[in-house]
């Protein structure tokens, strides 16, 4: 299907942080579409030539994935139809920090939103009762 530059959909992201060595989530939601096959999700990172992740026609399409994310990304495939484009990032690295863009194309149009992702060695605060 063709998308003209005149149609836009709402895409929403939330800034987040990832613990080095653990798995992280980059949150992104969008106006859902009726057909999964009409939804394309593309995750980008500023400064990176390849894609972080691509999901289209109901499955991952990783032919253009950048080397630094190979084998480390996944979307929640069963939740895409309800507008969840969040990305799971495995084994978070210090170098994963930066600005990401969640790009969405549906039959209604396209949209994108940026999010800042911080990485570090974070610990849960101790609570003394």
């Amino acid at each position: 299907f063709g998308i003209s530059g005149r149609h836009s959909i709402t895409v929403t992201t939330v800034a987040s942080a990832g613990n080095i060595g653990e798995d992280g989530i980059l949150s992104c939601t969008f106006e859902p579409d009726i057909k999964l096959s009409d939804i394309v999700i593309q995750w980008l990172k500023e400064g990176v030539l390849g894609l972080v992740h691509e999901f289209k026609e109901g499955k991952d399409e990783l032919s253009e994935q950048d080397e630094m994310f190979r084998g480390r990304t996944a979307v929640f495939a069963d939740q895409v139809i309800v507008g969840n484009a969040s990305l799971r990032l495995k084994n978070v690295q210090l170098t994963d920090a930066g600005t990401y863009k969640c790009y969405i194309i549906t039959s209604k149009g396209k949209g994108n939103a940026n999010l800042e992702y911080k990485t570090g060695a974070f610990s849960m605060p101790e609570v003394n009762v």
Epitope: E46, G47, V48, L49, G50, M68, Y103, N112
Partner: antibody, heavy 118, light 107 residues
Framework: EVQLLESGGGLVQPGGSLRLSCAAS????????MHWVRQAPGKGLEWVSG????????YYADSVKGRFTISRDNSKNTLYLQMNSLRAEDTAVYYC???????????WGQGTLVNVSS | DIQMTQSPSSLSASVGDRVTITCRAS??????LAWYQQKPGKAPKLLIY???TLQSGVPSRFSGSGSGTDFTLTISSLQPEDFATYYC?????????FGQGTKVEIK
């Protein structure tokens, strides 16, 4: 402020070699892919080569493949272009530029002129 | 390699005119297209990426549209500082080819 400053251009004979440098400042150099783009006198833009932030992936235009080598030293915040077996048609202003999103380029350096002539 | 074809190669226009430049890719590039402005003796400047997303600091009179193989750059009301050469570039696949350029001149 993000800045890119090219150097190393000059006059070289056909068949000769030259190494261009691009000094980067104002951003985390190792997080960004970098590119070389050239412009022959009075002509349009020609993408020459690109390299990923880590230096692990390199890309070339067919016109320079096997003759030019792109590299980077992230500890020195510097991008390089080693040009061998130079030809008259390589005469151009060479710009370095930073990857923004995918291969869209921003900002660009001011350029350095390479003149291949006998 | 993906070939990029711009039209027209040059055009003459007056201040206040609406100007449209087109770019065609030899194969589907989705919306991975960028537009640049270059003035004589200066480095190019990124205007638009992702076919329609305005780069930060670029005036809103510039807009981009299209997807697949056909793309358009529009200047809604030409200003004196807009007289320059404009290039499209596909940013989906190496080699990241440019169009041949469109020179916008004063009528």
């Amino acid at each position: 402020e993000v800045q890119l400053l090219e150097s190393g251009g000059g006059l070289v004979q056909p068949g000769g070699s030259l190494r261009l440098s691009c000094a980067a400042s104002g951003f985390t150099f190792s997080s960004y892919g970098m590119h070389w783009v050239r412009q022959a006198p009075g002509k349009g833009l020609e993408w020459v080569s690109g390299i990923s932030g880590s230096g692990g992936s390199t890309y070339y235009a067919d016109s320079v493949k096997g003759r030019f080598t792109i590299s980077r030293d992230n500890s020195k915040n510097t991008l390089y272009l080693q040009m061998n077996s130079l030809r008259a048609e390589d005469t151009a202003v060479y710009y370095c530029a930073r990857t923004q999103w995918r291969a869209s380029l921003d900002p660009w350096g001011q350029g350095t002129l390479v003149n291949v002539s006998s | 390699d993906i070939q990029m074809t711009q039209s027209p190669s040059s055009l003459s226009a007056s201040v206040g005119d609406r100007v449209t430049i087109t770019c065609r890719a030899s194969q589907d590039i989705s919306y991975w297209l960028a537009w640049y402005q270059q003035k004589p003796g200066k480095a190019p400047k990124l205007l638009i990426y992702g076919a329609s997303t305005l780069q930060s600091g670029v005036p809103s009179r510039f807009s981009g549209s299209g997807s697949g193989t056909d793309f358009t750059l529009t200047i809604s009301s030409l200003q004196p500082e807009d007289f320059a050469t404009y290039y499209c570039q596909q940013t989906t696949m190496s080699p990241y080819t440019f169009g041949q350029g469109t020179k916008v001149e004063i009528k």
